[in-house]
């Protein structure tokens, strides 16, 4: 039977793949030399374990989980990665002054295991 994309974390609350927010300054990110604003970013990222069939993104992730159980030294467990992103606009330094630039893959919106 096809495995279910489970949302129940068998490792306990907050231990499995989910969205985390980390407050970071431009200095923390190494952006201070090219970004002017915002000076602080609420960075959303995907962190956590990917146990059996938890938020499996696709059949490949399900297969990976099964094979990892059989051959943990050969096949790694699925990884927790963004399923989609929220866009963000930055005010950047340019040679002639400042400009706006949008980035569509900077902040995770939700997470899955792949």
């Amino acid at each position: 039977a096809r495995a279910r994309n489970g949302d129940h974390c068998p490792l306990g609350p907050g231990r499995c793949c989910r969205l985390h927010t980390v407050r970071a300054s431009l200095e923390d990110l190494g952006w201070a030399d090219w970004v002017l604003s915002p000076r602080e970013v609420q960075v959303t990222m995907c962190i956590g374990a990917c146990p059996s069939q938890f938020r499996a993104a696709n059949m490949h992730a399900q297969i990976k989980t099964s094979l990892h159980r059989l051959k943990p030294d050969t096949v790694p467990a699925p990884c927790c990665v963004p399923a989609s992103y929220n866009p963000m606009v930055l005010i950047q330094k340019t040679r002639t002054g400042v400009s706006l630039q949008t980035y569509d893959d900077l902040l995770a919106k939700d997470c899955h295991c792949i």
Epitope: L36, S37, P38, R39, E40, Q42, N86, P87, M88, V89, L90, I91, V98, L100, T102, D104, L107, K109
Partner: antibody
Framework: EVQLVQSGAEVKKPGESLKISCKGS????????IGWVRQMPGKGLEWMGV????????IYSPSFQGQVTISADKSISTAYLQWSSLKASDTAMYYC????????????WGQGTLVTVSS | QSVLTQPPSVSGAPGQRVTISCSGS????????VNWYQQLPGTAPKLLIY???NRPSGVPDRFSGSKSGTSASLAITGLQAEDEADYYC??????????FGGGTKLTVLG
């Protein structure tokens, strides 16, 4: 409660100068950008420019570059839009709006300031 | 001429479902996001949908947004008299930064 309160309606003659204001309250004024949007009578919305009140960085729409000046005074949580020489075609409703945290949309709007320029 | 194209008007009877389209290009909607605003008569615009399909708190779930390719849509189900307003889509364009559609006037019939 987040609020943007704009200054009152203005009636001016062509060639006169004008500065309208937008006072933010209920949030950290320097943590969010402020944009200005024009709406001419019976028309749609046009983005004019943006200011980061914390660093006073400003960026203008190409259509409004050199026509207006956007500024802010963070000590009184107020953003400004000004003209040095008004034209009849500047007659419009002007809105200030706060950007959402990631700078992609406007999450709160002022009530608008109607500017009428007529001889 | 707006970078984003919307129909000038749409209408529907109370209780019906209506959709408003917003057509762009590969330099705006095609690669990025769409936001929607509602402007009731004589008032300031209000954020209705952000980042294609997210509703701010307080916006009824009768309003929903979607995006496909270089077009986006706003759907309103269970149309109510108080939905009569102008609706604007907004995105980002590489040449002119923040851009709005020309606006769509929604009329609730009857």
């Amino acid at each position: 409660e987040v609020q943007l309160v704009q200054s009152g309606a203005e009636v001016k003659k062509p060639g006169e100068s004008l500065k309208i204001s937008c006072k933010g309250s209920g949030y950290s004024f320097t943590s969010y950008w402020i944009g200005w949007v024009r709406q001419m009578p019976g028309k749609g919305l046009e983005w004019m420019g943006v200011i980061d009140p914390g660093g006073s960085y400003t960026i203008y729409s190409p259509s409004f570059q050199g026509q207006v000046t956007i500024s802010a005074d963070k000590s009184i949580s107020t953003a400004y839009l000004q003209w040095s020489s008004l034209k009849a075609s500047d007659t419009a409703m002007y809105y200030c709006a706060r950007y959402g945290r990631y700078g992609t949309y406007f999450d709160y709007w002022g009530q608008g300031t109607l500017v009428t320029v007529s001889s | 001429q707006s970078v984003l194209t919307q129909p000038p008007s749409v209408s529907g009877a109370p209780g019906q479902r209506v959709t408003i389209s917003c057509s762009g290009s590969s330099s705006n909607i095609g690669v990025l996001y769409v936001n929607w605003y509602q402007q009731l008569p004589g008032t300031a615009p209000k954020l209705l949908i952000y980042s294609n399909d997210n509703r701010p708190s307080g916006v009824p779930d009768r309003f929903s947004g979607s995006k496909s390719g270089t077009s986006a849509s706003l759907a309103i189900t269970g149309l109510q008299a108080e939905d009569e307003a102008d609706y604007y889509c907004q995105s980002w364009d590489s040449s002119s930064n923040y851009v709005f559609g020309g606006g769509t006037k929604l009329t609730v019939l009857g």
